[in-house]
Interface confidence: low
């Protein structure tokens, strides 16, 4: 038996629910009771779930595990692994048996994203050109170990004295906390960047030292350059940060966040007290982070229609503001494959195949490919309609005339979050055969 | 499908102005920083500067600072490039080109070029 | 700014050879290093980013590897259409620079 699995390693969320994709070709007057399917851990052959005597045997792994009952006569052997942990990290073995035995050997990699590190500055008041400093970075239960990264304001790498540990916590994800000592110049933009080597994330945080008084008399306003960007329905932070002179009290700030198009009020802070939001109550400052000269607005359950730019104005003495961009997406749905005629395929006939995707943002990119992963530029038709909450529901169908056999795969890519979500189908002439579950690419 | 399409040749006097547009269509415009990169006559690429439309925030290379200024009109979804002040080494093709997201400063859509020549 | 240093300018090779342009920075870039392809009159085309990930819809023939300093893209097969110029280019940090280019023509 040809036993087929994804050459690379299947990348997984720490928490999510992840597929091994295996898959065999039954032969015709193919029947479950002949199949017997056995996955198991390749190193300690341990047994993680099997099918046998026409039923599932059921999960031998913590009750985390299930198969595709209704995929399995067409071929689909694929593993549902729930609730992914790091200790699941490590190679599955999928073993058929018909007559004849196959097996292949298919390998899961767990990853978690670092957070938004937070920036600690040891001494944090009367700073003057020369003094020494220390600026601690911590991130927070990310996996697996993160690259730490130091820039400066002009991204240039800070090599200097810095000190790197990294803690793994009782679930095996890792606190990482990065120290550099660094002696002031007259001001500077210090930056940490932790990086997740497997999910080519970046997490960024960054401390801007003013050590004297700037000679405009302006409160310098700092944001991130690039835009945050947010997960329809998670919490988004929009950074916002200024420096506290000596002396600084909350009773002299004034705070202001707005939308900077319309000028929209968001949230405020004044007369020493959070004025609360104006913004549909999803809105929160940090209050304890205040007097440290951290503006930041936290937006909760993040809608479509927040898309867009929003300005942080510090006021204390002086004035100060900049804007911060908030890019909001959502990930599409794994594509549904429908396919016509569907029966009694023959070489020359023409088929319409149709590609379903759902409640993504913003509008995606599609893509029709052949089995050689070679781009499909024939008859294809692409709609994209936006629901109520502004998310796009997918379209796409392609017209084509049939080989001997082929395979036509469906890419929809979320451009802003680079993922893709593949459906495929393959069309053997006779019989239709539909590939194991399609695979979600992550691109960061 | 992704598209940046620039306007037409120029020719210009030394001392002169060139305004170059380049509309974007088929993705969210405000989402993506917009880059201006040049090529001069059988020479290489050169990076002049970037916007994001979002919000206007801009970013110029040292060598063009005071002489170029970008821009960008969210209503239609066009950016410009201005070039102020111009001498025959500018003759060059100007393209626009859209930074790929996530924070890789790569070029994934680049528009079709606009010639300019500067001659007196 | 960071300089990038392509070798070689030129170079000449058969179809179906193997075919290997490098590029090296003036300071350490990490991996983002991008490679463009330009065809005579063409805009350039995005064929790898971040040192090694292929752009949608570029053949797998196209590979990039490299870190740091250093960098490599190879043409495992050399085709008729790959007939172009070749750059690199860092996004470290701004400005991003690019290489000098390499005119790669068939025998």
């Known amino acids: 038996v040809e036993v087929q699995v994804p050459e690379d390693p299947v990348v997984a969320l720490v928490g999510t629910d992840a597929t091994l994709r295996c898959s065999f070709l039954p032969e015709p007057g193919f029947s479950l009771a002949q199949l017997n399917l056995i996955w198991q851990l390749t190193d300690t052959k341990q047994l993680v779930h099997s099918f046998a005597e026409g039923r599932d045997q059921g999960s031998a792994y913590a009750n985390r595990t299930a198969l595709f009952p209704d995929l399995l006569a067409q071929g689909n052997a694929s593993l549902r692994l729930q609730r992914v942990r790091v200790a699941d990290e490590g190679s599955f073995t999928c073993f058929v048996s018909i007559r004849d035995f196959g097996s292949a050997a298919v390998s899961l990699q767990v990853a978690a994203p670092y957070s938004k590190p937070s920036m600690t500055l040891e001494p944090s008041k009367d700073l003057r050109p020369g003094d020494t400093v220390t600026i601690t970075c911590s991130s927070y239960r990310g996996y697996p170990e993160a690259e730490v990264l130091w820039q400066d304001g002009q991204g240039a790498p800070l090599t200097g004295n810095v000190t790197t540990s990294q803690m793994a916590n009782e679930q095996g994800l890792f606190d990482v906390r990065s120290v550099l000592r660094v002696v002031l110049g007259a001001n500077g933009t210090y930056s940490c960047l932790v990086r997740n080597p497997v999910l080519q994330q970046d997490a960024r945080g960054s401390v801007t030292i003013t050590p004297h008084r700037s000679p405009t008399g302006a409160v310098e306003v700092q944001v991130p350059e690039d835009p945050v960007v947010a997960l329809v329905g998670t919490d988004a932070t929009l950074c916002c940060s200024f420096s506290p002179e000596p002396g600084f009290s909350l009773a002299q700030l004034n705070l202001i966040w707005q939308l900077t198009d319309t000028k929209q009020l968001v949230h405020s802070f004044a007369e020493g007290r959070d004025q609360g939001s104006a913004y549909a109550n999803r809105t929160a400052l940090f209050p304890d982070l205040l007097a440290q000269g951290n503006a930041s607005l936290r937006l909760q359950r993040v809608r479509v229609a927040d898309e867009g730019s929003f300005t942080c104005f510090v006021s204390i003495r002086d004035f100060g503001s900049a804007a911060v961009s908030l890019q909001v997406a959502a990930p599409y749905s794994k594509p549904s494959m429908t396919l016509e005629p569907s029966k009694d395929l023959r070489p020359g006939d023409t088929v319409t195949i149709t590609c379903s995707s759902y409640r993504g943002y913003p509008e995606a990119e599609v893509l029709w490919q052949d089995g050689q992963g070679a781009p499909l530029t024939g008859n294809v038709t692409t709609s994209q309609m936006a629901n109520e909450q502004g998310l796009f529901d997918v379209r796409s169908v392609l017209r084509v005339v049939l080989g001997a056999n082929g395979t036509y795969s469906c890419l929809v890519r979320n451009p802003v979050l680079q993922q893709d979500a593949h459906g495929s189908v393959t069309i053997t002439g006779q019989p239709m055969t539909f590939p194991p579950e399609a695979h979600h690419h992550h691109h960061h | 499908q992704v598209q940046l399409v620039q306007s037409g040749a120029e020719v210009k006097k030394p001392g002169a102005s060139v305004k170059v547009s380049c509309k974007a269509s088929g993705y969210t415009f405000t989402s993506y920083w917009m880059q201006w990169v040049r090529q001069a006559p059988g020479q290489g690429l050169e990076w002049m500067g970037t916007i994001y439309p979002g919000d206007g925030d801009t970013r110029y290379t040292q060598k063009f600072k005071g002489r170029v200024t970008i821009t960008a009109d969210k209503s239609t979804s066009t950016a410009y490039m201005e070039l102020s002040s111009l001498r025959s080494e500018d003759t060059a093709v100007y393209y626009c080109a859209r930074r790929g997201i996530p924070r890789l400063w790569y070029f994934d859509v680049w528009g079709q070029g606009t010639t300019v020549t500067v001659s007196s | 700014d960071i300089q990038m240093t392509q070798s070689p300018s030129s170079l000449s090779a058969s179809v179906g050879d193997r075919v290997t342009i490098t590029c090296r920075a003036s300071q350490d870039i990490s991996n983002y290093l991008n490679w463009y392809q330009q065809k005579p009159g063409k805009a350039p085309k995005l064929l790898i980013y971040y040192t090694s990930r292929l752009h949608s819809g570029v053949p797998s023939r196209f590979s990039g590897s490299g870190s740091g300093t250093d960098f490599t893209l190879t043409i495992s097969s050399l085709q008729p259409e790959d007939i172009a110029t070749y750059y690199c280019?860092?996004?470290?940090?701004?400005?991003?620079?690019f290489g000098g280019g390499t005119k790669l023509e068939i025998k």
């Open positions: 280019q860092q996004g470290n940090t701004l400005p991003p620079t």
